[in-house]
Structures are given as structure tokens and as C-alpha cells.
Interface confidence: low
């Protein structure tokens, strides 16, 4: 059975996959997959290091640790729903059927909506998707773009709508109103 | 389109520690695959770095040998090599180069933009 893993939406997956190398620079080669690691190699392959050096990526994939110690954890860059799915982490130890195979599973969850303040006055309720991205470094918060406005007519319905949601206990919890007039 | 500026070459001892800078003209560097190579006396140009736009490294380990590490600093458009216990051999001009490319072999990217070079010497 697969370890499971969660992101939201833009934020970055990690995949932690580790070995001891048997001296420093005695590298295995790794590969990582999309799917869960079949008999030999990996399928739909995103990123492999062999022997000295990483050898082939693509582009939203990256080591962020040093893989020269064993560390060939996976960061995925702003992840979609699209990247949800069995990753495979395969350390290719020499030797007829050695090799190490991790199958890992990534739950993509969408970002949570967050609320912004509105003028008293205005008519317009817009609620900019805000999210932290968590990593080593300090948190980010990056604006991914607004949600439709809500124009007059379409408030009750929306009221009606956020009512028994999740989205409503959000707004609520944060203490955000929508006022009319 | 993107322009290289190397600097940070000079003269040094056997031993001794350099590090090398790559200034990108350009609001797009952090989409360039960046990287190092050098051309030694009487050697082909040859890889020595590179870094992706993530950060992803790569080191050619036949010579670097845990003694040279490449970084970016993204908000300063700039890549940068630095050079540990330097040896004779590693007398040669240094030149950065960057490439759009998003996926493949670091080493053997498409390298599309190249710096003039730096001339880094190393006395015994």
C-alpha cells in the first residue's frame, strides 16, 4: 500500500525518498515515476540521477535536497488537481531485483478560499484565492487570481448557496460580511 | 533574449577559492536553465555546472569532486560558481550560458545564450 501526501492547489508537493549512499559521491542511480513502480525501471519518468549526477528532469520537478547524501526527496511546483496520483521513488541498488521501490500517493486538495475585506459601500463581493505555499524556507502568500464578482442579483442566491457549505463556516469563522447599501 | 556578464576571474594560488558571477540582462531570468562551463588549454569546452529554474544541480563530477557549488539568486538575475581548493588544471576561461530548455539532460542542453568568459588562473 502507497504513503499518502497532501498539497493544496499552487502550493508545492514534497515526496520525501532517502538512501544511504555506501560512501559519499558512491551514488545509486534513482528514478521517479508517475504511477506505481512497475517490475523494472519507472514509468513516465520525471526526474533520474545515475551514478554522479541528476541526467534527466522535467520542468516542474526538482531535488531540493542534496541527493549527493541520499537525498532524492521530490518537489513538485504548484501543483494542480491533475497531480494527484501514485509517484514512484525506485533506488536502483545494483543486483538482479535489488532495487528499492517506494509507491507514494499525492492527494492534490483545492485551495482554500479566503475572503477580502470589502468597502461598505461596495456592490462587488470578490473573494481572491489566497494560499501559503509551506516549505524550507519562509512561507509565501501569492494571490492566484479572483473568483467572478458577484454582482447584486446573484447575493441571495449566494447567501442561499453558502449557507450549509464549508465556504459559509470559513467566511464566518474569519468574520467577513457582505453588506449591502 | 537574454544578455551574460561574467566577472570574478583573476589570479590565485594553488588551493585557493574563487567565486564567479553571472549577471542576466532581462526580467526573465528565473526561466533559464543557467550554467557553467570552461575551456582549459588545450582541452574542448567542457561542462562544469548547471542549476535549473527550480534549483535542481548538476556537477560534473569527473573533476568538480565536491569542490565547486552553483547557485541563482533570482531577484538579482545572477548565477553564481563557487570555486574551492583550486589546482593548476583548473586554469581556463569560465563562461556561463542559459537555455529555455525545461526538461531533459542538464549537461547536454540546448544552450542557446553565452557569456564572453571569465579567465580564472591558477598558480602552483
Known amino acids: 500500500s502507497e504513503v499518502e501526501y497532501r498539497a493544496e492547489v499552487g502550493q508545492n508537493a514534497y515526496l520525501p525518498c532517502f538512501y544511504t549512499p555506501a560512501a559519499p559521491g558512491n551514488l545509486v542511480p534513482v528514478c521517479w515515476g508517475k504511477g506505481a513502480c512497475p517490475v523494472f525501471e519507472c514509468g513516465n519518468v520525471v526526474l533520474r540521477t545515475d551514478e554522479r549526477d541528476v541526467n534527466y528532469w522535467t520542468s516542474r520537478y526538482w531535488l531540493n535536497g542534496d541527493f549527493r547524501k541520499g537525498d532524492v526527496s521530490l518537489t513538485i511546483e504548484n501543483v494542480t488537481l491533475a497531480d494527484s496520483g501514485i509517484y514512484c521513488c525506485r533506488i536502483q541498488i545494483p543486483g538482479i531485483m535489488n532495487d528499492e521501490k517506494f509507491n507514494l500517493k499525492l492527494v492534490i486538495k483545492p485551495a482554500k478560499v479566503t475572503p477580502a475585506p470589502t468597502r461598505q459601500r461596495d456592490f462587488t463581493a470578490a473573494f481572491p484565492r489566497m494560499l501559503t505555499t509551506r516549505g524550507h524556507g519562509p512561507a509565501e502568500t501569492q494571490t492566484l487570481g479572483s473568483l467572478p464578482d458577484i454582482n447584486l442579483t446573484q447575493i441571495s442566491t449566494l447567501a442561499n448557496e453558502l449557507r450549509d457549505s464549508r465556504l459559509a463556516n470559513d467566511l464566518r469563522d474569519s468574520g467577513a460580511t457582505i453588506r449591502i447599501g | 533574449q537574454v544578455q551574460l556578464q561574467e566577472s570574478g576571474g583573476g589570479l590565485v594560488q594553488a588551493g585557493g577559492s574563487l567565486s564567479l558571477s553571472c549577471a542576466a540582462s532581462g526580467r526573465t531570468f528565473k526561466n533559464y536553465l543557467m550554467a557553467w562551463f570552461r575551456q582549459t588549454p588545450g582541452k574542448e569546452r567542457e561542462f562544469v555546472a548547471a542549476?535549473?529554474?527550480?534549483?535542481?544541480?548538476?556537477l560534473n563530477e569527473d573533476f568538480v569532486k565536491g569542490r565547486f557549488t552553483i547557485s541563482r539568486d533570482n531577484a538579482k538575475n545572477t548565477v553564481y560558481l563557487q570555486m574551492n581548493d583550486l589546482k593548476t588544471d583548473d586554469t581556463g576561461v569560465y563562461s556561463c550560458?542559459?537555455?529555455?530548455?525545461?526538461?531533459?539532460?542538464?549537461?547536454?542542453?540546448?544552450?542557446?545564450?553565452w557569456g564572453q568568459g571569465t579567465q580564472v588562473t591558477v598558480s602552483s
Open positions: 550560458a542559459a537555455s529555455l530548455q525545461s526538461g531533459g539532460s542538464l549537461r547536454y542542453a540546448k544552450y542557446d545564450y
Open positions: 542549476i535549473t529554474q527550480l534549483g535542481t544541480r548538476s
